[in-house]
Interface confidence: low
């Protein structure tokens, strides 16, 4: 049982109160984390509570304000970036969100040496992306889909690309599908380590079909939003990678990096770029059928001023049981010899582990092994490799940080975090300074989150950066639910689950059960993290039991579980939720007549299919922004797991796995369907088609749309959404208001 270790129990029960929905909607019990903005081995920047930008030196213990809140306020800045030579700061204002990562903003350059904003050759507005070179104070930025370079902030810009065009050609920034499903960034340009070269991607969306939807706004006529968005099987973006010498950009101009022949023979993706040295770069490519990935190491040829990618430096990663990688193909972390690297991929037993590749993938040396998974490589130094895994005590939903000494033989392994605050902290991430001289640990739970600073040599804790004292005090008089993380063994499958129980839970009583599901490939819901959210309220105040179950297709428990859903989404994920519900009923404290399921996005798809499974287990359920047919979702994501919707590939399962095909089965459940009309990700089309199928089958259901809201249903819509869902569930469970 995972109890909240930082809860202070008040002996007088009557001073304790349950959580309210208002608490959740107001964010009363939200926590803070502290991630240092490292600028050297021993220095970091942090934005103070009163908005000053402060530089901290760990070794001298000194701190000073490099930028006052007054300067920040003068341009309404919400973000900043210090140039590596510490002469300038860019200030970001007029933030305007586009998609998940992308936004535009206005940028001002502040000169720290004279305490004034740089005048002359100011930056255009709005800018799509801007960044400093890793050394000095060169600037690269993207404006109207073209890339520009400045040698110094006050210099006139040098235009690198000229073919950028809205919704057609994207330079240095990704199009919609690359942003959301491949790069997971707002940028597609990369400086070489010392700023000599700048690499960038060009995405050509000319032939991609466009999704169009109305944005109602408050004008007389709605606007139409058009996004080149390749759905499963559609024409994809065409990608090219270029590198330009930023010292003499006009000398030879951008040079294209060749695509490996085995990749270029059919549709392909570019998946990531990693600089090794100023004259060596590593590109990763992926076939459209995403079970073959090629890592290509390319070298600069001074004589020809071109980039050469010899076949001997191509490393192939292939999956025979599923797709390549986990959610994404992992990226390499190069060692100091600038040719060998560390990378996470499946071992022979089907668990993702760290391997060391010196010449060929076939000769890779396995660094970690076991029936658990290495999750992230944080840093490789001359003598240490820092990584995270879920090895400790065999709980897949934990994350601890480990250090492997690679300087000695045989390498020795040490868990840095396992015993630090064992009850409070079981889920960590880390942030390292240059050369891993120092690092910050951020613990997300299961207790109240805490961020600490550590010595990179001895692992000694130096200081607490953030311990959420106010939150701890605020929770002292709150009756929080209890949480359990346990597992079910069913037909050789391990189903981990998290159960959230009412504060006065009594095993001899019967409780309504709500299943919260996501269930998407390579996701994980059962994690040892702290949260006070809507389901906490439902358990605390409304007396519901809430369960989250990680079934087949979920991550970090080996390829057998992960790849079980390959080419047949919508089957085992649903089956495993149903299996778990049956096991929960057998536990004796669930009211069989009051079971519900809800989910968002992929979870909305799974909850819809579970409600329509014909089992009679669920009384009601909610789908928020669900996928309803894989033919409606993005090519890069969908085809990774489903293949192509063609007759000779996997069209039959595309057709079988729709929510619409099961419309009849909704007759015996109460269904609430919710979607934002301006959802750029899972298009409103998905819910429109479910609604149409239910109407055609003459099946009654409830629905709510959120006008002009995207996939996140943010702002006031959030409050309306959770209030609406709460009423629906309370009605379903016959709970009084």
């Amino acid at each position: 049982i995972v109890l909240r270790p930082s809860r202070v129990h008040n002996s007088e029960e009557n001073t304790m109160r349950a959580l309210t929905l208002k608490d959740i909607l107001n964010g009363t019990f939200s926590y803070k984390t502290f991630f240092p903005n490292w600028i050297s081995g021993q220095e970091y920047l942090h934005q103070s509570a009163d908005n000053n930008i402060v530089l901290y030196n760990i070794e001298t213990g000194q701190s000073y304000t490099i930028l006052s809140n007054r300067t920040m306020k003068s341009v309404n800045a919400s973000n900043y970036g210090l140039s590596p030579d510490r002469q300038f700061v860019y200030l970001e204002s007029d933030y305007s969100k586009l998609w998940r990562y992308s936004y535009t903003a206005t940028y001002y350059i502040y000169d720290l040496s004279n305490g004034e904003f740089v005048r002359g050759n100011e930056l255009p507005r709005p800018i799509q992306y801007l960044c400093w070179s890793p050394v000095g104070s060169k600037l690269a930025y993207v404006y109207q889909n073209n890339i520009y370079l400045k040698q110094r902030p006050g210099d006139p810009p040098f235009q690198i690309t000229f073919n950028g065009r809205e919704n057609k050609i994207f330079n240095g920034i990704p199009d919609w599908v690359y942003e959301e499903e491949m790069l997971a960034t707002k940028y597609a340009l990369w400086w070489s380590p010392n700023g000599k070269f700048l690499a960038y991607a060009e995405f050509n969306d000319t032939d991609i079909p466009v999704i169009a939807y109305s944005y109602y706004g408050d004008e007389q006529y709605p606007r139409t939003i058009n996004i080149p968005y390749p759905k499963a099987g559609a024409k994809n973006p065409v990608v090219r990678i270029f590198i330009i010498d930023t010292t003499y950009p006009a000398y030879v101009g951008p040079q294209e990096v060749p695509v490996p022949a085995m990749i270029a023979s059919s549709d392909y993706y570019f998946s990531w770029l990693t600089w090794v040295t100023d004259e060596r770069v590593c590109l990763q490519w992926l076939k459209r059928v995403q079970n073959v990935s090629v890592l290509s190491i390319c070298d600069f040829r001074e004589d020809w001023q071109t980039w050469d990618c010899p076949k001997t430096q191509e490393h192939i990663e292939e999956s025979r049981t599923g797709w390549a990688g986990g959610f994404f193909v992992s990226t390499p972390v190069f060692s100091y010899d600038a040719i060998s690297y560390y990378k996470i991929f499946s071992d022979k037993d089907g668990y993702k582990h760290i391997h060391y590749i010196k010449d060929t993938v076939e000769n890779a040396i396995q660094i970690t092994s076991g029936k658990w998974e290495a999750i992230n490589i944080f840093r490789v130094t001359q003598d240490s490799l820092f990584y995270s895994s879920n090895e400790f005590e065999e709980y897949p939903g934990r994350r601890n940080i480990y250090r492997i000494s690679i300087g000695s033989y045989p390498p020795s392994k040490k868990c840095v975090t396992c015993h630090l605050r064992k009850e409070r902290c079981q889920y960590y991430t880390a942030s390292f300074s240059d050369y891993a001289k120092y690092y910050a640990l951020v613990c997300y739970g299961p207790g109240i989150p805490i961020s600490t600073l550590h010595d990179g040599r001895t692992d000694q804790e130096i200081k607490i950066l953030e311990e959420n004292k106010e939150l701890e005090n605020a929770l002292k008089n709150i009756q929080l639910p209890k949480e359990e993380i346990k597992k079910l063994e069913v037909d050789e499958i391990t189903l981990w689950y998290k159960m959230i129980l009412p504060p006065q839970f009594d095993r001899s009583k019967k409780y309504p059960l709500l299943i919260q599901v996501y269930g998407g490939p390579c996701s994980q819901s059962v994690r040892s993290v702290f949260a006070v959210n809507w389901i906490s309220y439902l358990a605390s105040k409304e007396g519901m039991v809430i369960a989250l179950v990680d079934g087949r297709g979920t991550a970090f428990q080996g390829d057998k579980l992960l790849y079980a859903v390959y080419r047949k989404l919508g089957v085992y994920e649903v089956e495993d939720q149903i299996t778990a519900v049956r096991k929960f009923i057998e536990m004796g404290f669930i009211d069989e007549k009051r079971i519900a399921i809800w989910g968002w996005s992929y979870g909305g798809y799974v909850s819809s299919l579970a409600l329509a499974s014909g089992t009679g287990l669920f009384k009601c359920g909610i789908a928020v922004a669900p996928v309803s047919s894989w033919e409606y979702y993005a090519s890069v994501y969908t085809e990774r797991f489903m293949g192509l919707p063609t007759k000779d590939d996997n069209l039959e399962h595309y057709k079988n796995s729709t929510v619409m095909a099961r419309a009849e089965y909704f007759r015996n459940v109460d269904y609430l369907l919710i979607h934002g009309t301006a959802d750029d990700n899972v298009h409103f089309q998905n819910s429109a088609q479910i609604a149409k199928a239910l109407v055609n089958a003459q099946v009654d259901f409830q629905a709510m749309w959120y006008s002009d809201q995207n996939h996140g249903l943010s702002g006031l819509s959030t409050n309306h959404l959770y209030t609406h869902m709460t009423h629906f569930l309370k009605q379903c469970f016959s709970l009084s208001d």
Partner: nanobody, 122 residues
Framework: QVQLQESGGGLVQAGGSLSVSCAAS?????MGWFRQAPGKQRELVAA???????NYADSVKGRFTISRDNAKNTVYLQMKSLKPEDTAVYYC???????????????????WGQGTQVTVSS
């Protein structure tokens, strides 16, 4: 209402072969075979869609073959290298959803035959 009529089954020595068939009274997307040994849960053995897509339980892969004649609305299960643990009542199942071939939970299937006994002696 779809009616299912099973035939075949019987007694066979371990290592031997046997086949069962099932005819449906109407056209149907998914057809399959489940089995139930005494005191055990009914489990999916194999299933096939009208398009010929198949799904097998791990325990029978390579030994059992499911096939289908759409013109006759009939499904066949050819069982080879039989083991004593294959002993069970074999039930024909059918459903109007193509996706059902992946549902190993028998409660998910709509139409059922009466069952036919298969006994494998050692």
């Amino acid at each position: 209402q779809v009616q299912l009529q099973e035939s075949g089954g019987g007694l066979v020595q371990a290592g031997g072969s046997l086949s069962v068939s099932c005819a449906a009274s109407g056209s149907i997307f998914s057809m399959g075979w489940f089995r139930q040994a005494p005191g055990k849960q009914r489990e999916l053995v194999a299933a096939v869609t009208s398009g010929g897509v198949t799904n097998y339980a791990d325990s029978v892969k390579g030994r059992f073959t499911i096939s289908r004649d759409n013109a006759k609305n009939t499904v066949y299960l050819q069982m080879k290298s039989l083991k004593p643990e294959d002993t069970a009542v074999y039930y024909c199942a059918a459903d109007s959803s193509r996706g059902k071939i992946y549902f190993s939970n028998y409660r998910s299937w709509n139409y059922w035959g009466q069952g036919t006994q298969v006994t494998v002696s050692s």
